[in-house]
């Protein structure tokens, strides 16, 4: 008879296939984790719709100089579609993982610091574009909270632009029999010894991939277009619909630049719930999912995440 | 109970092709990735790569990728191995280990382990 | 590829001792480490996972710790019982590489 190991968290099934499976090239990647915290409102912001409070994550750039890099979105829900939108809404849960521990968890639930989606946005340099992503909040769930605090600083490239990116959360609370996620405990410290204990580490994972049909054009500069618009619409609503596991955090910066079209953005993941060649193989299987849906036909895809290590004391911003 | 039972010991002469089965019982065969390991007498552990039963999609080490075919017949909820063109090195045990489900970063349960001799 | 370097590569050491076994990835794995213990003739069995938590059924002697690049297990007090080797893995990335090991014998 094969040998057997008792199971963490003890044994558990689902008929559906939790983990996706597909091919990846080998990168040696480093992650990036960092606490998620709210700051004052920012004055002047531009909202989208389906937000009824914008706030700002304060970054360092990679040169040291405080940047904000975009918004939060709160739990506003709103069922209606996005006009021009071709799919239903993006079906976003403003609340982390719930206050009670999964069964089979082996560590206490992780605690969220604000009680909506965040925002973490790159810049586009002059040859992209990047701006707000709309979203609609279908459900609202209760977010926990922890004391408000000072923020820890982490960094992500800038490439020198403003126009920021509204983070597309898809973090669900959902039940742990169907998700299976509770045999992973949150981790609740960072990887840096220069780095306060985290009460939320998350993950960045810088994604790219080519739209190998579309042509990159003067639209795709301006986030004011339609065309730009319905892009990013349609790639917000491709990766909830791809990473739908609850501990999804949401996506920031969705860019294009040139070479037909090469689109970038960040995705964000509770830390330790993933790894780098999940994060790719996830997306590319559903890359004839999203040919179809939205006319998109998608190669070259490339997963890595945001580099590591930074201080927190120092603010020393990304190498390179 | 979770069990992976594998097929028995093989011997195989240099450039032939082997096929090993590791036969899945007490779980949901298709909702957990199979991942294949070998071992060399006396040596460690080489991973060689896997196959999600329920995508049927497979991913190799590039260093078996032109030799290594890893599949899966879910009726039968049994992963396959197969390894062509061998050659002396690759005398070893060959285990399938299952892999956690939904963010389980490790194998939980082993094959017994089936040994093939590649000898002339 | 992230290499995956253990040390020693072997170890004799008492009942009772405290026994440590190093990991050293190549590359920043980010707690994604798992460890297994193999006794002589048999499968490998899971000990360790996401670096430091223990399977249930593993006896509470064995403790994983460490981050990013360095990591380790740690016996508290070795009984005859744990003479096997001992194997960290890789499961960051692909592909989803082991440790050399290191075999562990009772002086």
């Known amino acids: 008879s094969g040998h057997t190991n008792s199971t963490p968290g003890g044994e558990k099934e689902t008929s559906a296939t939790q983990r996706s499976s597909m091919p990846i090239s080998t990168k040696n990647a480093v992650s990036m984790t960092s606490r998620l915290s709210s700051h004052s409102p920012v004055s002047g912001s531009s909202t989208t719709q389906g937000q009824d409070v914008t706030l700002a994550l304060a970054m360092e750039s990679a040169t040291g100089s405080a940047t904000t890099l975009g918004h939060v979105v709160t739990s506003a829900p709103d069922t209606s579609a996005a006009p021009g939108s071709t799919g239903p809404p993006a079906h976003v849960v403003t609340s982390a993982p719930d206050t009670s521990a999964a069964p089979g968890s082996t560590g206490p639930p992780a605690h969220v610091v604000t009680s909506a989606p965040d925002t973490v946005t790159s810049a586009s340099d002059s040859a992209s574009g990047s701006a707000s992503t709309l979203v609609h909040s279908t459900t609202s769930a209760r977010a926990t909270t922890t004391p408000a605090s000072k923020s820890t600083p982490f960094s992500i490239p800038s490439h020198h632009s403003d126009t920021p990116t509204t983070l597309a959360s898809h973090s669900t609370k959902t039940d742990a029999s169907s998700t299976h996620h509770s045999t992973v405990p949150p981790f609740t410290s960072s990887n840096h010894s220069t780095s306060p204990q985290l009460s939320l580490g998350v993950s960045f994972f810088f994604l790219s991939f080519h739209i190998s049909n579309l042509q990159f054009n003067s639209s795709l500069e301006d986030p004011s277009t339609n065309y730009y618009q319905q892009l990013q619409r349609d790639i917000s609503e491709l990766f909830l619909q791809i990473y739908k596991q609850g501990d999804f955090l949401g996506l920031s910066n969705i860019m294009f630049r040139p070479g037909s079209v090469v689109v970038q953005s960040t995705l964000v993941f509770r830390e330790g719930t993933t790894n780098v060649h999940d994060v790719e193989t996830q997306f590319n299987q559903r890359k004839t999912e999203a040919a179809s849906r939205y006319n998109l036909t998608i190669s070259d895809i490339s997963v890595r995440d945001v580099p590591f290590p930074f201080s927190a004391q120092t603010g020393a911003g990304v190498p390179g | 109970q979770v069990q992976l039972v594998q097929s028995g010991a093989e011997v195989k002469k240099p450039g032939a092709s082997v096929k090993v089965s590791c036969k899945a019982s007490?779980?949901?065969?298709?909702?957990?990735?199979m991942h294949w390991v070998r071992q060399a007498p006396g040596q460690g552990l080489e991973w060689m790569g896997y196959?999600?039963?329920?995508?049927?999609?497979?991913h190799y080490n590039q260093k078996f990728k032109d030799r290594v075919t890893i599949t899966a017949d879910k009726s039968a909820s049994t992963a396959y191995m197969e390894l062509s063109s061998l050659r002396s090195e690759d005398t070893a045990v060959y285990y399938c280990?299952?892999?956690?489900?939904?963010?389980?970063?490790?194998?939980?349960?082993w094959g017994q382990g089936t040994l093939v001799t590649v000898s002339s | 590829d992230i290499q995956m370097t253990q040390s020693p590569s072997s170890l004799s050491a008492s009942v009772g001792d405290r026994v440590t076994i190093t990991c050293r990835a190549s590359g920043n794995i980010h707690n994604f480490l798992v460890w297994y213990q193999q006794k002589p003739g048999k499968s490998p069995k899971l000990l360790i996972y996401n670096a430091k938590t223990l399977t249930s059924g593993v006896p509470s002697r064995f403790s994983g710790s460490g981050s990013g690049t360095q990591y380790t297990l740690t016996i508290s007090s070795l009984q005859p019982e744990d003479v096997a080797t001992y194997y960290c893995?890789?499961?960051?990335?692909?592909?989803?590489?082991f440790g050399q090991g290191t075999k562990l014998e009772i002086k």
């Open positions: 893995q890789n499961f960051w990335n692909v592909p989803f590489t």
């Open positions: 280990a299952r892999q956690g489900n939904y963010a389980a970063y490790y194998f939980d349960y």
């Open positions: 007490g779980y949901t065969f298709t909702t957990y990735t």
């Open positions: 196959i999600n039963p329920g995508s049927d999609y497979t």
